[in-house]
Interface confidence: medium
Amino acid sequence: TPEVWVQVRMEATELSSFTIRCGFLGSGSISLVTVSWGGPNGAGGTTLAVLHPERGIRQWAPARQARWETQSSISLILEGSGASSPCANTTFCCKFASFPEGSWEACGSLPPSSDPGLSAPPTPAPILRAD
């Protein structure tokens, strides 16, 4: 059955810069990916990027670069400076809309004991919502 994994990493070179990687483990075709922070998209979270396989990518500060890594995974780099920069305990969520199954969402944050540049391997995170 479909699953979503989320990996959050702090960059060693820029301690206030984060990379979020998300992936979808399922057989459906991905229609849309939404990355948010502060909670699930639409439930208190703020959208950082929207990635559409054909229509392209939209991103909002402090997102610096959102891109497709594979047909079923994406990455997002966040700027670390400014009032809106993320902190170590910020929660990031990824929502994959997979046709026709629906929306599958998981959230993750920086592992509490992680050193800069290190992170846990991308294991499936708890799915908060599979509408």
């Epitope: 059955t1 229609s31 639409g42 046709f99 026709p100 199954e101 599979a130």
Partner: antibody, heavy 122, light 106 residues
Framework: EVQLVQSGAEVKKPGASVKVSCKAS????????IYWVRQAPGQGLEWMGT????????SYNQKFRGRVTMTRDTSTSTVYMELSSLRSEDTAVYYC???????????????WGQGTLVTVSS | QIVLTQSPATLSLSPGERATLSCSAG?????MHWFQQKPGQAPRLLIY???NLASGVPARFSGSGSGTDYTLTISSLEPEDFAVYYC?????????FGQGTKLEIK
Amino acid sequence: EVQLVQSGAEVKKPGASVKVSCKASGYTFTDYWIYWVRQAPGQGLEWMGTIDTSEHKTSYNQKFRGRVTMTRDTSTSTVYMELSSLRSEDTAVYYCARDFIITVNYPVVDYWGQGTLVTVSS
Amino acid sequence: QIVLTQSPATLSLSPGERATLSCSAGSSVNYMHWFQQKPGQAPRLLIYSTSNLASGVPARFSGSGSGTDYTLTISSLEPEDFAVYYCQQRSSLPFTFGQGTKLEIK
């Protein structure tokens, strides 16, 4: 107000085809998928398939593969479900529904058409 | 395909009583959705993603479960709750519904 209005009841002979329409209003048509469910008299619900109104992708229940075709017309915000090679066991009420899955924001609510009775009889 | 088995087929209770409806999946699913249907009407979504209340659904309805076993609970039955209830899985194609549980007035 969100509405899904389906075409009227149909009586068909075995072997014929039927095309049921589902006209959407009150929301942005391409923001939501539409799926079709049928219900034979006194029986339960059966998912027939789903259409992505934006991309025109379809996913059908294997049981109906080859007999069912779902299409959409964005200019009229209408989805069509055509079922061919009808047999008596296809007699049922056919419902279209706006898929509650792809929601931009919560809360989640579903909307259904009123249903279309298709009777297959010789 | 994943077969969903609902039990009991018919549940006879009185208003004010607690109703517990079960849905068992032939193999594990991530989430379950629940619909209510009254005679001559289209189904109505009650619970999505196992435990989330759809818009406008009273708080007396709740859902729980995981894996292969899911439950819909109505804490205190109101007269308008007597209807047929269906569970649905969307974890695997084709999407399937249970055969339904008829909740009738005792």
